[in-house]
């Protein structure tokens, strides 16, 4: 969480940013909140990207103001119009590129007064993964598989059972490269499982960490899975 | 849930004065501008006043100034309309609404003001 | 002062019946324009905000458009409940204004 204040104007004015995380190919948001005015008319938003000359959003006078825009930009930002007069200055991103990643400024302008907040925007990919157990291998094995991932993530597989034991001597782990030849396919084998356990294959890089686990019984499969952005926390 | 409370009826003589309330609960108070609106008998909407509790910025109606003065006291979430110089044509209803996620999202109940000789 | 001006000041329908209320702003406003419906001893309820975003809870049989200077409120096919008068106001500058009204009554 990053709080700032204007330096200049009537008084400043508080703008808070949390830093987020982008998935490439989706869309993301930059995140970023101020004091709220009463008219539409006098709020300025504008985001800027360190090391970028042009803007990447403007909004004024009620409307997007995008003659100033890069054109890395072109066509892929939008605010929440109806969410503006209520001090939301969040940013849409489409399709998050690589690219998008870096620190952003987000510089208010109201009727009461001027102030900005920084944010750091990580990009890569992550996914949910999905475990399964693998009817195919000669011994009782658990596959985990996830879509998407970016940059390489480490995979360490745990039970519930067994605390503490490590995995690695029994799992193996490959990583193909997607069509895009950006992301990557992440799937972990683990061997040997025993009934009545519950397994958890923990996938994790600097972005994001996510679980999935598989509780395996006689008459049933139970799964379960979530995923963490690990850069949101306030800091 | 967001709720608004205003103070109850008041009759006031021409050149008295009137202090109206309206307490807030159920969202943050300070972050969200508070607003005052009348209606006369009969008559439209009319926008007097706005107060921003977490800094007591004000915006008022041309109108209403050295009519009205609004004032907030965040420890209680309460804000405050004084109407000051009471002449007959203030006879209204005076609603206090705030602006959470939309405009004017919620509203109080109201609190009529009859000015009488 | 920004002037908004809502026509016409009674509109007599029957349940059923498609309802279209204008609002008439006297200079740009943008999307800054809100919708609300009061009934007789009740404070206002907010309809539609920033021009077209259907309020929490709100049927989807009222509907707003427009931006600049004109804005409609649509009520596609009347309930008994939605006889009642509907005001417009703007939040582009202040002083921020209402119109005066449209009255929904039944034929």
């Known amino acids: 969480l990053i709080i700032g204040f204007g330096i200049s104007g009537r008084h400043s004015i508080t703008v808070t940013t949390v830093a987020s995380a982008g998935n490439i190919g989706e869309d993301g948001i930059l995140s970023c909140t101020f004091e709220p005015d009463i008219k539409l008319s006098d709020i300025v938003i504008q985001w800027l990207k360190e090391g970028v000359i042009g803007l990447v959003h403007e909004f004024k006078e009620g409307k997007d103001e995008l003659s100033e825009q890069d054109e890395m930009f072109r066509g892929r930002t939008a605010v929440f119009a109806d969410q503006v007069i209520v001090g939301n200055a969040s940013l849409r991103l489409k399709n998050v590129q690589l690219t998008d990643a870096g620190t952003y400024k987000c510089y208010i302008i109201t009727s009461k007064g001027k102030g900005n907040a920084n944010l750091e925007y990580k990009t890569g990919a992550f996914s949910m993964p999905e475990v399964n157990v693998d009817y195919n291998a000669s011994s009782e094995t658990l596959r985990c598989e996830a879509p998407r991932w970016f940059p390489q993530p480490t995979v360490v597989w745990a039970s519930q059972v067994d605390q503490g034991a490590n995995f690695s001597e029994v799992s193996n782990t490959s990583f193909e490269l997607n069509s895009e030849n950006v992301t990557m396919k992440v799937v972990s084998v683990l061997y040997n499982v025993t009934i009545n356990n519950t397994y958890s294959c923990m996938i994790e890089n600097d972005i994001a960490k996510a679980t999935g686990d598989i509780k395996v019984t006689e008459s049933e499969i139970k799964r379960r899975s979530h995923l963490q952005l690990l850069n949101s926390k306030a800091s | 849930q967001v709720q608004l409370v205003q103070s109850g009826a008041e009759v006031k003589k021409p050149g008295a004065s009137v202090k109206v309330s309206c307490k807030a609960s159920?969202?943050?108070?300070?972050?969200?501008?508070m607003h005052w609106v009348r209606q006369a008998p009969g008559q439209g909407l009319e926008w007097i006043a706005a107060?921003?509790?977490?800094?007591?910025?004000?915006d008022y109606n041309q109108k209403f100034k050295g009519k009205a003065k609004i004032t907030a006291v965040t420890s209680t979430s309460t804000v405050y309309m004084e109407l000051s110089s009471l002449r007959s044509e203030d006879t209204a209803v005076y609603y206090c609404?705030?602006?959470?996620?939309?405009?004017?999202?919620?509203w109080g109940q109201g609190t009529m003001v009859t000015v009488s000789s | 002062e920004i002037v908004m001006t809502q026509s016409p000041a009674t509109l007599s329908l029957s349940p059923g019946e498609r309802a279209t209320l204008t609002c008439k702003a006297s200079?740009?406003?943008?999307?800054?324009v809100a919708w609300y419906q009061q009934k007789p001893g009740q404070a206002p309820k907010l309809l539609i905000s920033s021009a077209s975003y259907r309020y929490t809870g709100v049927p989807d049989r009222f509907s707003g458009s427009g931006s600049g200077t004109d804005f409609t409120l649509t009520i596609s096919s009347l309930e008994p409940e939605d006889f009642a008068v509907y005001y417009c106001q703007q939040h582009y500058n202040t002083p921020l204004t209402f119109g005066g009204g449209t009255k929904v009554e039944i034929k």
């Open positions: 200079q740009d406003v943008s999307f800054a």
């Open positions: 159920g969202y943050t108070f300070t972050s969200y501008w």
């Open positions: 609404t705030t602006t959470v996620a939309h405009y004017f999202d919620y």
């Open positions: 107060i921003y509790p977490g800094n007591s910025d004000t």
